[in-house]
Structure formats: structure tokens, C-alpha cells
């Protein structure tokens, strides 16, 4: 009887381990505006908060500006990027801006980087208006393997809105890989 | 033997209760356009449908214009807000518009309101075009506690698109809090 | 004792079947640009990849340009649509564009089509700029029944960005229907 109970218990523990909702990895990272690069070209954003305000992480790792996957699975990835300019911040070099975000995946085993999602818009931000704002949102469902890294690239980083509700990205595991 | 089986059953029921997919709270609320406030300043939208068309709610509560959390957990929150103007609706007071959405969380215990997500754009809606349209989408993963309330604020509410496929917000629980 | 164990095992297997994370249907479909229709009016996009690059599908079916639901449930649906134009591609017929996406659900039992989500923007793409770009993202939580079909309609399909990171849509099951 004990052996049979142990077998049932073993099965139950196995299921518990695999399907227990609170085991699922996630991250919500918010921009750290103390270290935003300048320039208008595409750059990788490496400074993000993971443990203050809305920022949080569990069963994933944040290192060297990248979100590292610790557990194989299918994840929903998302990013929200806000750009803004007030005339008091200075004069823009061009009214014609390309405000873009790229969510990229890097595999260490095969050192290559691929864009999973992109979004954005060309904008005409004229000096005739004292304030300009624009936000991008992207999201999608991707297979991620342990050790793979997610990073964010943007154009015109000096125009980023530094608020935690404005510029962030994240991921949560939805299911295992079959 | 019965005691041991009861113990296994108890564990199983406990897991079933906690991880059963169909127990997970969710809501998808669509704009109720019969009661949209006017003006161009930021206002809280309090009229939403929760039980008609695409609108639905389960294990969450909609009250006083707010989506109330009944179950602690990590939730994916989202909002889609569409603005539109046709020249037959009248003349705009200004061509320079700030079309914004703010998804806010209010805690009753500590009566304070915080913005979880924001998005939008400044737009130039000229009289040279008979029709203007713009949509915002935001989404993110947040820890919510029972009793906390989610609400939506927008600028220029009189420009909201009243269709259920256009202006809505929602949430679904992804996992428990450890 | 065996009967009692069988009962526990039966319950356990039932739970495993229902809550096992890896049983959940999903799809992430990327644009197949070899067959994009022309024109500026609203058209249904029927050519999508389901098994190359980031595109993948499990426990759902892709047929005749539509994503078919095989399992009742509540799903999170999303779409990301990018439009772009470079002056080397030719002159636009009009600077005033309506760049839109519509995510629609069709029920075969009741042959009717309904829009679940829409997004987009009117844009002024002037000849003064050599390149224009704009992306739309929509997402929402919907009850889908087996046999229902999800499809994507857009305006100005000839302006679609053909990259897999740019123009895609998808779905993943979050929970069962009570």
C-alpha cells in the first residue's frame, strides 16, 4: 500500500512541479534613465531596473543589459517604449525622426542575434509645437531556450521617456516545450 | 489506508484548486459610449460593459468604473484605445492634440493611485483631411493584490471610438504570488 | 485498495490532461510576402507562414488563410502590423493614408464575421521624406470555440513590411471555459 501511495505521490509531485502556476518564470523591467546613451542611431539599451517600483523578476536573470532565460519554454514577450521631447530640452537636428524599437534574441551557443519583433513610426516633430510624444507597443509568443538572451534596441535613445510606466519590457512563460 | 488516501486526495484537491486553469480570473471590458465625458483634459473612464458582446468578467469585479481584483496574483494587463474624428462631427478647437491613455492602480488600504502603463502620441489633425484616426495599445505584467482597482484615464475622451473592437481594456491572471 | 488508487489516479490523470501546460494551443504566424494583394482598400491577408523562422503552431490549424481553433477556451490574441514606404518604391497615389488592421472571428456554424480588435492611424506621408514607417499592435482576451476562425484584414496591403519580425499575428490559450 505504501509503495502504491508513493507512486501516486510521485506522480502528483511531478505534476505539481510542472504545472504549479507559481513556478513560471517572468520579468518586467523598467528603464534606468541614469544611463541612457545619446545619438540618433540604433543602440542597445543596457540599463534596466529589475527590483524597484513595478520592476520584478523571477526564475529569469538580468545581466549585462540582457534578460537571460533560465528555463526552456514558450514565452509571451512584450515591450512598451515611449519617446518625448519638450522644446526646453533643446533643438532637434531634424524634424523627420525614425522612432523604433527592436526586441532581439541572442544565442550564446551560436553567437548570433535575431530580431523577434519590431515596431515604431517615422514622425515629423516640428519646432512649431512645444511638446511631442509617441509610444510603441509590441508583443508576441516565442520559443525560448535556457541561456538565450533578450535585449532591446531603440533609435534616438536620448528622446526616451524615463518613467517606469512609459518605457519597459517583459516576458512571462506560458507553457513548456512539448 | 483511508487516511493515507485522504491525505493524497487532500493534496490533489489543493493543487487542483490552485492550478486549475479554469479558476483563473480575467476581464475584458469594452467602452460604454452612452456616457463618455467631454473636454480635452485627462479624465477617468467609468462606463464600461462587462457582459455584452466581447465583454466578459470572471473572478474579478467591475464596480464604480473600476476593475477590482478579487484574487492575489500576477496578471497581464492590456488596453486598446482608439480616437477618431470626422469633419461632420464639428471643428476641432486645436489641430495639436495629445492623445493618451494611462492604466492606473489604486489601493484602498493606502488610498493612492499609481500609473502602471501609459501610451499615446501627439498628433496634428489638420482640417485638410476629412477623417482622422489613431489607436494606442499598451500591455504589461503586474503583481495585483485582492482589493486593488484598475482604471483607465484618457485625454480627449470626446474623440474616443465607441466600438467594442476599438476601445477596451482587460486582464488575466497568469500565476500566483510565491 | 486498488479501486481507491485507481480513483485517485483517474482524478490525477484528469487534472494532468486539463492543466498540463504543454497541452495548451498556440500559434504565431508571420507574413508570407510572396503573395500580398495590391490596392488601398481593406483586404483579408491569406498568406502566412506557420512553420519557418519564428512562425509556429500547435493544437490549432492554419487553413485557407485563417487560423482555426481546435479547442474551446479563452485565448489571448495579438497582431503586429508594420507598413513602410521608400521613395524608390514609387510615388504614392495620395499622401493621406488610412493604415489599419482588423482582427476578425468567423463562425462556420453561423456564417458571420465579427471584428474582435482594430487599430491603426491616419497618416500623412509626404514626398518631402524619403522613407516612411508605421506599426500597429493590438491584443485582447477572447472566448473562442472549436471551429471558429481568426483572420487579419488590413488596408493598403502593398505597403506591408514583409519581415517576420514586423508583420505577424498569434494566439495562445490561457484557460478553459468554465
Amino acid at each position: 500500500i505504501r509503495a502504491e501511495k508513493a507512486m501516486v505521490d510521485g506522480s502528483w509531485l511531478d505534476l505539481a512541479k510542472r504545472s504549479k502556476l507559481e513556478a513560471q518564470p517572468f520579468a518586467h523591467l523598467t528603464i534606468n534613465a541614469t544611463d541612457i546613451p545619446s545619438g540618433s542611431h540604433k543602440v542597445s539599451l543596457s540599463s534596466w531596473y529589475h527590483d524597484r517600483g513595478w520592476a520584478k523578476i523571477s526564475n529569469m536573470t538580468f545581466s549585462n543589459g540582457k534578460l537571460i532565460v533560465n528555463q526552456d519554454g514558450f514565452y509571451y514577450l512584450y515591450a512598451n517604449i515611449c519617446f518625448r521631447h519638450h522644446e526646453t530640452s533643446g533643438d532637434l537636428a531634424t524634424e523627420y525622426l525614425q522612432l523604433m524599437v527592436y526586441v532581439t534574441k541572442t544565442s550564446i551557443k551560436i553567437p548570433s542575434s535575431h530580431t523577434l519583433m519590431k515596431g515604431g513610426s517615422t514622425k515629423y516633430w516640428s519646432g512649431n509645437s512645444e511638446f511631442h510624444f509617441y509610444s510603441i507597443n509590441v508583443g508576441g509568443f516565442f520559443k525560448l531556450r535556457s541561456g538565450e538572451e533578450i535585449s532591446i534596441e531603440v533609435s534616438n535613445p536620448s528622446l526616451l521617456d524615463p518613467d517606469q510606466d512609459a518605457t519597459y519590457f517583459g516576458a512571462f512563460k506560458v507553457r513548456d516545450i512539448d | 489506508i483511508r487516511a493515507e488516501k485522504a491525505m493524497v486526495d487532500g493534496s490533489w484537491l489543493d493543487l487542483a484548486k490552485r492550478s486549475k486553469l479554469e479558476a483563473q480570473p480575467f476581464a475584458h471590458l469594452t467602452i460604454n459610449a452612452t456616457d463618455i465625458p467631454s473636454g480635452s483634459h485627462k479624465v477617468s473612464l467609468s462606463s464600461w460593459y462587462h457582459d455584452r458582446g466581447w465583454a466578459k468578467i470572471s473572478n474579478m469585479t467591475f464596480s464604480n468604473g473600476k476593475l477590482i481584483v478579487n484574487q492575489d496574483g500576477f496578471y497581464y494587463l492590456y488596453a486598446n484605445i482608439c480616437f477618431r474624428h470626422h469633419e461632420t462631427s464639428g471643428d476641432l478647437a486645436t489641430e495639436y492634440l495629445q492623445l493618451m491613455v494611462y492604466v492606473t492602480k489604486t489601493s484602498i488600504k493606502i488610498p493612492s493611485s499609481h500609473t502602471l502603463m501609459k501610451g499615446g502620441s501627439t498628433k496634428y489633425w489638420s482640417g485638410n483631411s476629412e477623417f482622422h484616426f489613431y489607436s494606442i495599445n499598451v500591455g504589461g505584467f503586474f503583481k495585483l493584490r485582492s482589493g486593488e482597482e484598475i482604471s483607465i484615464e484618457v485625454s480627449n475622451p470626446s474623440l474616443l471610438d465607441p466600438d467594442q473592437d476599438a476601445t477596451y481594456f482587460g486582464a488575466f491572471k497568469v500565476r500566483d504570488i510565491d | 485498495i486498488r479501486a481507491e488508487k485507481a480513483m485517485v489516479d483517474g482524478s490525477w490523470l484528469d487534472l494532468a490532461k486539463r492543466s498540463k501546460l504543454e497541452a495548451q494551443p498556440f500559434a504565431h504566424l508571420t507574413i508570407n510576402a510572396t503573395d500580398i494583394p495590391s490596392g488601398s482598400h481593406k483586404v483579408s491577408l491569406s498568406s502566412w507562414y506557420h512553420d519557418r523562422g519564428w512562425a509556429k503552431i500547435s493544437n490549432m490549424t492554419f487553413s485557407n488563410g485563417k487560423l482555426i481553433v481546435n479547442q474551446d477556451g479563452f485565448y489571448y490574441l495579438y497582431a503586429n502590423i508594420c507598413f513602410r514606404h521608400h521613395e524608390t518604391s514609387g510615388d504614392l497615389a495620395t499622401e493621406y493614408l488610412q493604415l489599419m488592421v482588423y482582427v476578425t472571428k468567423t463562425s462556420i456554424k453561423i456564417p458571420s464575421s465579427h471584428t474582435l480588435m482594430k487599430g491603426g492611424s491616419t497618416k500623412y506621408w509626404s514626398g518631402n521624406s524619403e522613407f516612411h514607417f508605421y506599426s500597429i499592435n493590438v491584443g485582447g482576451f477572447f472566448k473562442l470555440r472549436s471551429g471558429e476562425e481568426i483572420s487579419i484584414e488590413v488596408s493598403n496591403p502593398s505597403l506591408l513590411d514583409p519581415d517576420q519580425d514586423a508583420t505577424y499575428f498569434g494566439a495562445f490559450k490561457v484557460r478553459d471555459i468554465d
Epitope: 545619446s38 545619438g39 540618433s40 542611431h41 530640452s89 533643446g90 533643438d91 532637434l92 537636428a93 531634424t94 524634424e95 523627420y96 515629423y124 516640428s126 519646432g127 512649431n128 534616438n156 536620448s158 528622446l159 | - | 518631402n128 524619403e130
Partner: nanobody, 126 residues
């Protein structure tokens, strides 16, 4: 590659006005951020003013604000500098400069500009 040729310099009395022009050839003028620099006798080259690609954003050094106005006509591929209330300390060789927008904000440093004209001399004296 863009070629720049300045004109309009000369001798003017203090308090007087002058308009400099800079004609651009080769390259798409509307894609360039344009600026004016000056070099007084025995001194280094200094930033005066710059204008965005479309002409709606302008930046000036404090000493010329409210006296000088930069403008451009993208249809004529020409940059202008309207100078009023001129002072003896404005005496310098004025250079027109161009660059593609590699920075978000108007570049004010000499090294941020890729193309230069030969310069035109402005002398403010009674």
C-alpha cells in the same frame, strides 16, 4: 558629397545689417543639418547657429540670440544668415557647414560637421 559656397560678406557699420547666403550643390540638401560658424582674427572657429533639416528647429550661441536669424530654403538648396544690430566683435570669417543628422539634437561642435565652405569675411567697423 555636398559642396558649399558662401556669399554676402562685406564691410558694414556697427548697428547695421547683412545677409549671408550659402549655396549647396551635390547631395540632397533637405537631408542635411546646416550651421554657421565664425573665426575671428587670431581665434579658433566657434559655433554661431544651426538649423534642422526641415527648418523649424534653430539653435544660437547666446551672444547672437535675438540679433541673428538662420533660415533655409530647401527648394533652392540655400542656407541664409540674417545679421542685425552688428557689433565690432562680430567681425570674422563666416563658414557654412553641413552634416547628416547623427545626433538627436542640433550639433554645436565643429567636429560634428562633415562639409565646409571656404568662408566669407564680415567686417564690422566705422
Amino acid at each position: 558629397e555636398v559642396q558649399l559656397v558662401e556669399s554676402g560678406g562685406g564691410l558694414v557699420q556697427p548697428g547695421g545689417s547683412l545677409r549671408l547666403s550659402c549655396a549647396a550643390a551635390g547631395g540632397t540638401f533637405r537631408n542635411y543639418v546646416m550651421g554657421w560658424f565664425r573665426q575671428a582674427p587670431g581665434k579658433g572657429r566657434e559655433f554661431v547657429t544651426a538649423i534642422s533639416t526641415g527648418g523649424s528647429w534653430t539653435g544660437y550661441v547666446d551672444s547672437v540670440k535675438d540679433r541673428f536669424t538662420i533660415s533655409r530654403d530647401n527648394t533652392k538648396n540655400t542656407l541664409y544668415l540674417q545679421m542685425a544690430s552688428l557689433r565690432p566683435e562680430d567681425t570674422a570669417v563666416y563658414y557654412c557647414a553641413a552634416t547628416t543628422p547623427a545626433t538627436t539634437y542640433l550639433p554645436r561642435s565643429e567636429r560634428q560637421y562633415d562639409y565646409w565652405g571656404q568662408g566669407t569675411l564680415v567686417t564690422v567697423s566705422s
